[in-house]
């Protein structure tokens, strides 16, 4: 009696269980009563990442430098190429099909989390006692200078964008 289901790594065809092709190979011909499944390795820039019965291998992803992409991991016959973004850029999606420039944190804001190839810069406002006077994708908020530890006094209070201005004791009003 012909089978209705096959074992793992097999497929049903013409009432017969045939072996699937292993990752990295494509199907050339189905098995018969007398022959095994015929498989062939994928070509140079192709891959198949599962046990399969595909007659064509998939083309490796192209990391287009015009879109800010570069190869993070070269593809094999069993894996696709993994793209990432050039330094200073990050992917616009999980599939990383294109890149955008990392955001900079404006003055008054510091970097909470530096951007990666897949995530943008996360900024946070500088609280009282801290400042950032630059637009940067790397700089955290800096603490105000402690005038006291320098034997000086505050002549002008700091803001979220400026440090305090220290001066000599005798200039105290």
């Amino acid at each position: 009696e012909p089978p209705t289901a096959c074992r793992e790594k097999q497929y049903l065809i013409n009432s017969q269980c045939c072996s699937l092709c292993q990752p990295g190979q494509k199907l050339v011909s189905d098995c018969t009563e007398f022959t095994e499944t015929e498989c062939l390795p994928c070509g140079e820039s192709e891959f198949l990442d599962t046990w399969n019965r595909e007659t064509h291998c998939h083309q490796h992803k192209y990391c287009d430098p015009n879109l800010g992409l570069r190869v993070q991991q070269k593809g094999t016959s069993e894996t696709d190429t993994i793209c990432t973004c050039e330094e200073g850029w990050h992917c616009t999606s999980e599939a990383c099909e294109s890149c955008v420039l990392h955001r900079s944190c404006s003055p008054g804001f510091g970097v909470k989390q530096i951007a990666t190839g897949v995530s943008d810069t996360i900024c946070e406002p500088c609280p009282v006692g801290f400042f950032s006077n630059v637009s940067s994708a790397f700089e955290k908020c800096h603490p105000w200078t402690s005038c006291e530890t320098k034997d000086l006094v505050v002549q002008q209070a700091g803001t979220n964008k400026t440090d305090v201005v220290c001066g000599p004791q005798d200039r105290l009003r």
Epitope: P127, V128, G129, F130, S146, C147, E148, V154, R173
Partner: antibody, heavy 122, light 113 residues
Framework: QVQLVQSGAEVKKPGSSVKVSCKAS????????IEWIRQAPGQGLEWMGS????????NYNQKFQGRVTITADTSTSTAYMELSSLRSEDTAVYYC???????????????WGQGTLVTVSS | DIQMTQSPSSVSASVGDRVTITCRSS????????????LAWYQQKPGKAPKLLIY???TRESGVPDRFSGSGSGTDFTLTISSLQPEDFATYYC?????????FGQGTKVEIK
């Protein structure tokens, strides 16, 4: 010990100004921020502004649109809050409080004055 | 400006009860550099100036009984009175000191049931 003593109650006409004083003792006046907070009858607390007496640096709540001026006299360890163009809704208790002491980590208000009631009425 | 929202606006409780007051800010009060939350809690009794209870969201001011505790991080904070005492009937305010202008919650009145 830290003490903040405020001037007495005032009754003012709409359109006039009021100047409330806050005399500090028991700490270094020039290096600690003085904060001004008000509370209308039966209402919550509203921050008005602050001053670092030694430098004269100030911060203001923009809500008061230039009606408030905060000053300090380090020779007498006294801070002042002047509110101009008074209207009936400025009727409130006005408090001074001590803010950061120069350490940049004590921005909360750990000592308060007793409050000054300002009544604006025609 | 950072908005502070307290709830409930009033609560009726008995001596010995556990009372919880919540405060929510419109932006995070947690600063990543020092991992501190820029939030304070105050107690105010009628006709008196407010009194500092808690700062940095969870640090008790010296002299404040340990039945008062503060917790929370980011935008959600709680003041808990573990066992209400007669002298605790008052209005409680949260306040942020992250950036100017400082703002307060609208207050929570703890009344006798």
């Amino acid at each position: 010990q830290v003490q903040l003593v405020q001037s007495g109650a005032e009754v003012k006409k709409p359109g006039s100004s009021v100047k409330v004083s806050c005399k500090a003792s028991g700490y270094t006046f020039s290096t600690s921020w003085i904060e001004w907070i008000r509370q209308a009858p039966g209402q919550g607390l509203e921050w008005m502004g602050s001053i670092l007496p030694g430098s004269g640096s100030t911060n203001y709540n923009q809500k008061f649109q230039g009606r408030v001026t905060i000053t300090a006299d380090t020779s007498t360890s006294t801070a002042y809050m002047e509110l101009s163009s008074l209207r009936s809704e400025d009727t409130a208790v006005y408090y001074c409080a001590r803010g950061d002491d120069g350490s940049y980590v004590r921005w909360y208000f750990d000592h308060w004055g007793q409050g000054t009631l300002v009544t604006v009425s025609s | 400006d950072i908005q502070m929202t307290q709830s409930p606006s009033s609560v009726s409780a008995s001596v010995g009860d556990r009372v919880t007051i919540t405060c929510r800010s419109s932006q995070s009060l947690l600063f990543s550099v020092n991992q501190k939350n820029y939030l304070a809690w105050y107690q105010q009794k009628p006709g008196k100036a407010p009194k500092l209870l808690i700062y940095w969201a969870s640090t008790r001011e010296s002299g404040v009984p340990d039945r008062f505790s503060g917790s929370g991080s980011g935008t959600d904070f709680t003041l808990t009175i573990s066992s209400l005492q007669p002298e605790d009937f008052a209005t409680y305010y949260c306040q942020h000191y992250y950036s100017y202008p400082w703002t307060f919650g609208q207050g929570t009145k703890v009344e006798i049931k």
